[in-house]
Interface confidence: medium
């Protein structure tokens, strides 16, 4: 039997190499420096030379979305924004509408709004109190459905209260990938006053509780909300069956009109060779066994 993959936040999100130390503008993190950031390739002279001249009339120039190096017009307050759109201007953050049931999706779709960053940080302080005491937890909502705060959160209503993952603990996560014989092992360091290290093996004790896809999905949703920046390629949340195993067909998110490519996997999420599409045509996985 093939081994289950490590959880997505450690595996598929390894493209989000999270930096240690204070964020820099190139990384596009919040000025507070609390959140993890994406490492982009440096904007060297060669990269800059490929840029077209910036637009002539702009209230403010900002870098292109994602890891782009060229300059473009910033979005102003109240304008729609998202992960793939132009950036909001200085002092503004892209935030989903308060009633979004899928804040992350809204930002991927460009349905966020550029809002005042100071208002957002005040909201963040308000929305993120100390974790409730274990055993008997209750929180007054008071517009906790105000969705994600400044980032592609899954929504403040969907956050875990485990102190280890609490944003106020200002911990920066570093993902290190290594190999251990036939299974991949991901070491995750939570760096704070006391360093706390956990090893996530590809075979988890929770294997009996949920299938690997279900665990991957939950871990992804629980961890995405603490990322201040997402990969410009978007984030893949796996397609699971009701037993928590991988459905045969997995797809990357679409970007605008461009369909994300799809591929076929077995029940443990291992890609099956020869079944992929780059969006030109649909991939058919139905003839294969994934159960």
């Amino acid at each position: 039997m093939q081994r289950a993959r490590p959880t997505l936040w450690a595996a598929a999100l390894t493209l989000l190499v999270l930096l240690r130390g204070p964020p820099v503008a190139r990384a596009g993190a919040s000025s507070a420096g609390l959140g993890p950031v994406v490492r982009c390739e440096p904007c060297d002279a060669r990269a800059l030379a490929q840029c077209a001249p910036p637009p002539a009339v702009c209230a403010e120039l900002v870098r292109e979305p994602g890891c782009g190096c060229c300059l473009t017009c910033a979005l102003s307050e109240g304008q729609p924004c998202g992960i793939y759109t132009e950036r909001c201007g200085s002092g503004l953050r892209c935030q989903p509408s308060p009633d979004e049931a899928r804040p992350l999706q809204a930002l991927l779709d460009g349905r966020g709004l550029c809002v005042n960053a100071s208002a957002v940080s005040r909201l963040r302080a308000y929305l993120l109190p100390a974790p409730p005491a274990p055993g008997n937890a209750s929180e007054s909502e008071e517009d906790r459905s105000a969705g994600s705060v400044e980032s592609p959160s899954v929504s403040s209503t969907h956050r875990v209260s485990d102190p280890k993952f609490h944003p106020l603990h200002s911990k920066i996560i570093i993902i290190k990938k290594g190999h251990a014989k036939d299974s991949q092992r991901y070491k995750v360091d939570y760096e704070s006053q006391s360093t706390d290290t956990q090893n996530f093996s590809s075979e988890s004790k929770r294997e009996t509780e949920y299938g690997p896809c279900r665990r991957e999905m939950e871990d992804t949703l629980n961890h995405l909300k603490f990322l201040n920046v997402l990969s410009p390629r978007g984030v893949h949340i796996p397609n699971c069956d009701k037993k928590g195993f991988y459905k045969k067909k997995q797809c990357r998110p679409s970007k605008g009109r461009k369909r994300g490519f799809c591929w076929c996997v077995d029940k443990y999420g291992q890609p099956l060779p020869g079944y992929t599409t780059k969006g030109k045509e649909d991939v058919h996985c139905y003839s294969m066994q994934s159960k």
Partner: antibody, heavy 125, light 107 residues
Framework: QVQLQESGPGLVKPSETLSLTCTVS????????WSWIRQPPGKGLEWIGY???????NYNPSLKSRVTISVDTSKNQFSLKLSSVTAADTAVYYC???????????????????WGQGTTVTVSS | AIQMTQSPSSLSASVGDRVTITCRAS??????LGWYQQKPGTAPKLLIY???SLQSGVPSRFSGSGSGTDFTLTISSLQPEDSATYYC?????????FGGGTKVEIK
Amino acid sequence: QVQLQESGPGLVKPSETLSLTCTVSGGSISTYYWSWIRQPPGKGLEWIGYIYYSGSTNYNPSLKSRVTISVDTSKNQFSLKLSSVTAADTAVYYCARYDIVTGYPHYYYYVMDVWGQGTTVTVSS
Amino acid sequence: AIQMTQSPSSLSASVGDRVTITCRASRGIRNALGWYQQKPGTAPKLLIYAASSLQSGVPSRFSGSGSGTDFTLTISSLQPEDSATYYCLQDYNYPLTFGGGTKVEIK
């Protein structure tokens, strides 16, 4: 197999607080969302709100000022409190597991896939 | 809040008939819609999620379709045990909202 059981008084006086508890058996309350839904006699369903096992909540704005949902993970229970009740709050109250499944084109969908059998609450003096 | 309007409010059909129930959202909800079946005196039961995905254990005669604002639940061959009230539920925005229900009776 996960089962849900609502419990609480079947009769509440106007202006008092309605209190119901949902006990989860056959599985852990952890890692799921848990919801309350109600159905007035002969009418449709109304979503009241949900709670995550960590304690995070989301309420229906139409009831928000009067609703509190809490969770007790040690007892595998979650509870509903509805204050200042009137006859309009007379209904069958259901608790349900509010789960996430993935799909396309959205990244995830919410489903209420396990329900309690419901408990009737009458508001009357 | 997003309003969900179901039609018809009730219908009567014979065993073996093809039955169609529609649900209209007051604004676009993509395919963030589920269908639930409720029999008298019992809790609702999930049939369809994500507009067209069949919940595990639900008979294949039930199917869902639609996207945006207009959705359909179809029972391809009505069975006696399908006599119930059917509700749609949008999970695109909070608050989650149900349709008013469609009561299906067997002739």
